[in-house]
Structures are given as structure tokens and as C-alpha cells.
């Protein structure tokens, strides 16, 4: 029988007293087959999150700070619930750490150094820790004592909590810098009368401060928010604008073996009898013998955390830099504005061998990081353990709801000034064999499909998508008969035609023969009756263009495209016969490596892009036999975004709202991820 | 297919050198660029170093100011000076040369270097 207790760990003993009251009356409402609590005491959070590393219990709930502490090794926990506060139909589980200015200051963030700063408090999230943590490597050295340093990076502050004799300047604009709400100062709403005030020039506080602290839009509209990319933006754009992302509170497991499945049900159990407003006799969010035991006082209830996310993606990217730089204290030497390499993420053992001579080439410009899928990559991007890599749109969208950026984007066409002119976008089409002269759009029921990868745009989001419109469900594995679909789930039928050997099978990269633009078409010629490919997929692969054995032969008259009127046209014909418009491929990367990325990609496409003429003895960035490896074959340039610099505006509102409406089909455990930290 | 074959290998002591050689059968080597990769047990395979054909070199961190690459075209040989070797130095080393364009699975036999006391 399989054990279903979950061991709760306590810090004291008003705690250990609620946990034990908690046991009971869970054991009163749940069947004797379903999850129970158990308690156990330990004398602080480290030792709680010890013991659940040591398997001696199983969860506790951390503020942020400790959610860090947890996911550091040896611990290796993650987050598996969150609380959320705010009501069930609006669920908050972050709140935003943010700077807030006066409109007419005129300074951007790189600019803070000399300014007055008001606090919330010494050793507090928003108001300190995050601030301080990603200003850290601007400090002035030694930045041992922080405070010390903080004091003579700014003019004046007030730091409530801060030791006044030491570090008058940290009590300048708060004489006394006394650590209650005596300080008028102090906290979140003190933070801000400090600015309001005019006492200080910046206030480091959370997005709720403002709003609850002016009930007037006029009177918020004087006030601004310091972006990380130095811009500013106005106060409820915090979204886009802040400086860290900060869960409220979490509970974590163990990473292994970490039961989350049967946390989850204990607590989702445990909210439907205990939560807000349910049960007299046990209330799960309220605390008569002390504050916030076991679960915050003021949450409304539980949240799922999406089993992808990991701690790193959950704390997101900016709040670990912080409490990276304050705990280790370690910058880099001498900060410059020369751009540190580009860690470029490559898929599989194919693109890894591009990107190596590439980042041989590049005399160190450019690194190589390697993932098995694109969503990995993705995510090593998001948390900084690569930098940037060039994606289908489909991805692009991916990117986008996890904060990334595009930056540059792949061009198809010769034209002279290339760089200047990012295009249209290129057609998705559906290819088939001419010799199957009954095929057509409205017959492909029962027939053999062939994908690029799923969540790509040709292969997948755009035939997909048209198809959920007529079949209104996401069974697309039911209504073809087989497929290679690669990124599906291996025992699917649209893993069936697939030609990747043992582990290979189906996966979304280069081992699996069926891969890609390439690939899918691959599939068609060997074993289906349609492919969702791009318009340049034929002509690239026959008349001897393609050496490879399965194509060398191939004429480019023997295949058709299915049009949406559910006629048939030759291949040359795709700007009449087509499935839609897809958007180029893009460079992403993270915003606060954008400019780099910008700068250093168009240095090395002057170098090695489509002006090199002999690719049999030079490195040319844009070629790889076919085989679209790092960036699609026929690139001719990577181009300037102007305008179009987020996803949104990238791919267009009709493609993203294409890709929106599949989202109901998603498997994608990143886009949950993703979600889940901004919905 | 250009035929590799790594020489050179051997056991020796931390902080000694060994200079690992790297002999291409094929017109291609004068104009290709080049690399040393190593593939340590239950580890990775991995850039150690690469020359361009210009002669520009490259090396992953671990390993600059210790590790030299080089070339003699005219002998179609490529070269791994490794000086004050570690520990963590010990793997198969294997030399490619990219001519066939990254999605090959061909790698030669490589030769062994074992650094230990």
C-alpha cells in the first residue's frame, strides 16, 4: 500500500500546535484511502528544508528568500504549491519588487548612483534585498560591509532597521532609522511618503504600494517605474517593468520522490473543507495562537505549481541575480561595456558541432550551450544558462509568455539592404505526392501526416490550428491514421511514421530523421500522404539540390499543394495555395541582453553570413546542408526589428491569436510554466 | 570522408605535458578548421580547442594558458600541446575537422590521456 502521509515540518511550537490540528480534522473529512498530514518540529526553516532533503519529513511553506535556499544543493527541493491571495477568479502568487520615481526626476536606473533611496527596511525583499542584490556589482568597493558600500553609492537614504551609528547616511533622510511604524518611514507606505515626501528620489517598495497608497489615477500618473533596460514605464505597467517577480509564498518537496502529487491533493482536500470562509471549527488561513502558522494568514487559497517549473523559473532570473550577487558576493572584474560572449543554445549533437566551429571562428564571441529540445533551451535562455538561439514562431510565442525578447530575425530574400528590411513572413503550406491525385484539404481523415515538430508554425500551429476549427478537438492523433509529429508523446500515432532509432524516436531534434522542414518532407517521399512544410521546402530538396540518398533523385514536379478551396496547385504556385502567412524565424534572448546579442550577431553575420562565398573551406553561419542547423538554410541576413521588438508585435495579432486558440491542444509544459508566473 | 588519426596519448603525472598529434588523410585539411575534443567516463564530449584556417585559435577556459593548439599544413597534422596537465584532464581526446559539416557521427579512435599520480 502505498504511504499517502504527508510530513509536515513545523518551526515552533504554535505551529507544531496547528499542524496537530490540522491532522485531526483533515482525518475527520478525508477518506481512511486518502492523504493524511503528519507533524513534525524542527527549530527552524533550514532545518525544515534539511530534513526534507534528508527525507525526514516532506513540506514546508518558505517565503521567497528560503524557496532559494531550499533549491541550493545539497537540498535540491521545488516548489510544488503556491499560496495566492486576492480572490479565486484574479489568483496573485507573485507580487513585483519595483522602483518607483517622481515623472519629472529624469534618471534611468543605470543612473541611481549619487541619488537619495528610500527603503522599506534592512534585509527586506522588495525594498532591499532585490535592489541591492542587482545594483550589487555597481557598488562601489569594497562592498564589504554592504551598507557601507550602499551608503557611498548613494547621496542619502533611509534604510529603517539599519545601525545609525554606523551608517548615518543609511538614516539621512530617516533620522534614527527606527525599525517600526513609529518610523514614518518605514515599510511599504513609509517607502513611499519617503519619496512623496521628497525626502528621497527612488523608492524601492512593491506594485501594490502605489495603488494603495494614491486611490487617484491622477495623483499616480506623477509617478513613474525605472525598468531594468533603463526606460521608464507608468505605474500599472509593473508587469513590464520592474525589477524582480517574487513568489509570496511556497511550499516545496523534494525534487525526487518528492510526493508534490499527494501535497497537492492534501492541500487542494484541505482548501475545499478549510480554506476562507468554509469551516468554523478549523480555519487552514488563520492563526489564534500566533501569525501566519504553517500558511500565510492573508492567502486565499492554493495554486498547483506546473510540474516543469523548477525553482530558478520559478523565482525567475532577476530575483535569483539578486540573492545570487548579496549571498556570494562575486562580480565580475572590473565591469566594462565591452558585451561578455554570446552563449548560443544548440540542439542536440548535430547543432553542437555547427555552433563549436562557429564559436572556434568567432575567437570566443560566441559560446555553445547545448539542450536536448527546443523548450530546454528555452528555459536554460530564461535562467541565464545560455543566451540566445533563432526560432520557428511557434516558439517565438513560447519565448515571449516566458519574458524572452526577439531580437533579430532571419531573412529569406536577396535584397540590398537586407539588414534594414525584415520580411513579411514565408507561407506554410501542405505538400503531397501527385501520383494521390484524390488527396485534398478536405479528405486528409484517416491519411498519414508529416510535421516539422509540434508548437513549430509550418508543421504544426497554423494545420493544427485550421484543423481544431473543423473538428473542434484536439485529438489530431485520432483523426490522421499515423504520423511523425516529432514531440509527441511516444506511445501516439503521430509517433508512428517516425525513423529516429531506440531514445531518438520522435524526439524534437536532429536524431530524429523526420525532423524539421527537411525531415517531414523526408517523410512524405518514404511513408505519408501529406507534409506541413514551408513554400521553400520542395525546390530545396529536389532537382539535385539535396545530395542526401532519399533525395537526390526527386523531381520537383512530382508533388502538389493542397489548397484551402480544396482544389490542388504546382508547387511554384504557393502564393495562391498556401495555409497562411507564417512569421520568419527570430533571434530571442533575454531583455537585459538584448543590445549585446544585437550587437555581437550582426558583427559575426558581417563576418561569416551569406557575403562568404566558399562555404567548403570557410565557416558560413547561414549553411548546414539542409539539415536548417542553428538557423534556417536559406537565410540571406538576420535583420532589425525596428518597432517589433516584442513577441506580440513580432508575430502579429492574427498568428498569436491563432496560436492562443490552440493553446486548449498544448502539451507544452514550458507555455504552463510560463503561464503560471504571468497568466 | 577525411580519415583522423589521433597519436600521442599516454599516462602522466599532474603538472607534466604531452603534445597529442592529430594526422588527416585528404586535400581538405589545408582549408578546414579544426578541433581537439575530449570525452571524459559518463561525461559529454567536448571542445578543448579549434584553429581556423587562418590560424586564430580558441580554447574552452579550463584549459588556456596551459593547452596550445596548432597546424602544419604542409605535413596535413594538427597539434595539442598540453602542459601542466590535471586530473581533470583525463579522457579520450579526439581531433575533427568540421569538413563534413557538422552532422556526421564519424570520430576516430581517439587516444587516451590519463593524468595521475
Known amino acids: 500500500v502505498p504511504d499517502k502521509t504527508v510530513r509536515w515540518c513545523a518551526v515552533s511550537e504554535h505551529e507544531a500546535t496547528k499542524c496537530q490540528s490540522f491532522r485531526d480534522h483533515m482525518k475527520s473529512v478525508i477518506p481512511s484511502d486518502g492523504p493524511s498530514v503528519a507533524c513534525v518540529k524542527k527549530a527552524s526553516y533550514l532545518d525544515c528544508i534539511r530534513a526534507i532533503a534528508a527525507n525526514e519529513a516532506d513540506a514546508v511553506t518558505l517565503d521567497a528568500g528560503l524557496v532559494y535556499d531550499a533549491y541550493l544543493a545539497p537540498n535540491n527541493l521545488k516548489p510544488v504549491v503556491a499560496e495566492f491571495y486576492g480572490s479565486k477568479e484574479d489568483p496573485q502568487t507573485f507580487y513585483y519588487a519595483v522602483a518607483v520615481v517622481k515623472k519629472d526626476s529624469g534618471f534611468q536606473m543605470n543612473q541611481l548612483r549619487g541619488k537619495k533611496s528610500c527603503h522599506t527596511g534592512l534585509g527586506r525583499s522588495a525594498g532591499w534585498n532585490i535592489p541591492i542584490g542587482l545594483l550589487y556589482c555597481d557598488l562601489p568597493e569594497p562592498r564589504k560591509p554592504l551598507e557601507k558600500a550602499v551608503a557611498n553609492f548613494f547621496s542619502g537614504s533611509c534604510a529603517p532597521c539599519a545601525d545609525g551609528t554606523d551608517f548615518p547616511q543609511l538614516c539621512q533622510l530617516c533620522p534614527g532609522c527606527g525599525c517600526s511604524t513609529l518610523n514614518q518611514y518605514f515599510g511599504y507606505s513609509g517607502a513611499f511618503k519617503c519619496l512623496k515626501d521628497g525626502a528621497g528620489d527612488v523608492a524601492f517598495v512593491k506594485h501594490s504600494t502605489i495603488f494603495e497608497n494614491l486611490a487617484n489615477k491622477a495623483d499616480r500618473d506623477q509617478y513613474e517605474l525605472l525598468c531594468l533596460d533603463n526606460t521608464r514605464k507608468p505605474v500599472d505597467e509593473y508587469k513590464d517593468c520592474h525589477l524582480a517577480q517574487v513568489p509570496s509564498h511556497t511550499v516545496v518537496a523534494r525534487s525526487m520522490g518528492g510526493k508534490e502529487d499527494l501535497i497537492w491533493e492534501l492541500l487542494n482536500q484541505a482548501q475545499e473543507h478549510f480554506g476562507k470562509d468554509k469551516s468554523k471549527e478549523f480555519q487552514l488561513f488563520s492563526s489564534p495562537h500566533g501569525k501566519d502558522l504553517l500558511f500565510k494568514d492573508s492567502a486565499h487559497g492554493f495554486l498547483k505549481v506546473p510540474p516543469r517549473m523548477d525553482a530558478k523559473m520559478y523565482l525567475g532570473y532577476e530575483y535569483v541575480t539578486a540573492i545570487r550577487n548579496l549571498r556570494e558576493g562575486t562580480c565580475p572584474e572590473a565591469p566594462t561595456d565591452e558585451c561578455k560572449p554570446v552563449k548560443w543554445c544548440a540542439l542536440s549533437h548535430h547543432e553542437r558541432l555547427k555552433c563549436d566551429e562557429w564559436s572556434v571562428n568567432s575567437v570566443g564571441k560566441i559560446e555553445c550551450v547545448s539542450a536536448e529540445t527546443t523548450e530546454d533551451c528555452i528555459a536554460k535562455i530564461m535562467n541565464g544558462e545560455a543566451d540566445a538561439m533563432s526560432l520557428d514562431g511557434g516558439f517565438v510565442y513560447i519565448a515571449g509568455k516566458c519574458g524572452l525578447v526577439p531580437v533579430l530575425a532571419e531573412n529569406y530574400n536577396k535584397s540590398d539592404n537586407c539588414e534594414d528590411t525584415p520580411e513579411a513572413g514565408y507561407f506554410a503550406i501542405a505538400v503531397v505526392k501527385k501520383s494521390a491525385s484524390d488527396l485534398t484539404w478536405d479528405n486528409l481523415k484517416g491519411k498519414k501526416s508529416c510535421h516539422t515538430a509540434v508548437g513549430r508554425t509550418a508543421g504544426w500551429n497554423i494545420p493544427m490550428g485550421l484543423l481544431y476549427n473543423k473538428i473542434n478537438h484536439c485529438r489530431f492523433d485520432e483523426f490522421f491514421s499515423e504520423g511523425c509529429a516529432p514531440g509527441s508523446k511516444k506511445d501516439s500515432s503521430l509517433c508512428k511514421l517516425c525513423m529516429g532509432s531506440g531514445l531518438n524516436l520522435c524526439e524534437p531534434n536532429n536524431k530524429e530523421g523526420y525532423y524539421g522542414y527537411t525531415g517531414a518532407f523526408r517523410c512524405l517521399v518514404e511513408k505519408g500522404d501529406v507534409a506541413f512544410v514551408k513554400h521553400q521546402t520542395v525546390p530545396q530538396n529536389t532537382g539535385g539540390k539535396n545530395p542526401d540518398p532519399w533525395a537526390k533523385n526527386l523531381n520537383e514536379k512530382d508533388y502538389e499543394l493542397l489548397c484551402l478551396d480544396g482544389t490542388r496547385k504546382p508547387v511554384e504556385e504557393y502564393a495562391n495555395c498556401h495555409l497562411a502567412r507564417a512569421p520568419n524565424h527570430a533571434v530571442v534572448t533575454r531583455k537585459d541582453k538584448e543590445a549585446c546579442v544585437h550587437k555581437i550577431l550582426r558583427q559575426q553575420q558581417h563576418l561569416f553570413g551569406s557575403n562568404v562565398t566558399d562555404c567548403s573551406g570557410n565557416f558560413c553561419l547561414f549553411r548546414s546542408e539542409t539539415k536548417d542547423l542553428l538557423f534556417r538554410d536559406d537565410t540571406v541576413c538576420l535583420a532589425k526589428l525596428h518597432d517589433r521588438n516584442t513577441y506580440e508585435k513580432y508575430l502579429g495579432e492574427e498568428y498569436v491569436k491563432a496560436v492562443g486558440n490552440l493553446r486548449k491542444c498544448s502539451t507544452s509544459s514550458l507555455l504552463e510554466a510560463c503561464t503560471f508566473r504571468r497568466p | 570522408q577525411v580519415q583522423l588519426v589521433e597519436s600521442g596519448g599516454g599516462l602522466v603525472q599532474p603538472g607534466g605535458s604531452l603534445r597529442l598529434s592529430c594526422a588527416a588523410s585528404g586535400s581538405i585539411f589545408s582549408i578546414a578548421t579544426m578541433a581537439w575534443y575530449r570525452q571524459a567516463p559518463g561525461k559529454q564530449r567536448e571542445l578543448v580547442a579549434g584553429?581556423?584556417?587562418?590560424?586564430?585559435?580558441n580554447y574552452r577556459d579550463s584549459v588556456k594558458g596551459r593547452f596550445t593548439i596548432s597546424r602544419d599544413n604542409a605535413k596535413n597534422t594538427m597539434y595539442l600541446q598540453m602542459n601542466s596537465l590535471k586530473p581533470e584532464d583525463t579522457a579520450v581526446y579526439y581531433c575533427t575537422d568540421y569538413s563534413s559539416r557538422y552532422y556526421h557521427d564519424y570520430w576516430g579512435q581517439g587516444t587516451q590521456v590519463t593524468v595521475s599520480s
Open positions: 584553429i581556423t584556417r587562418s590560424g586564430s585559435t
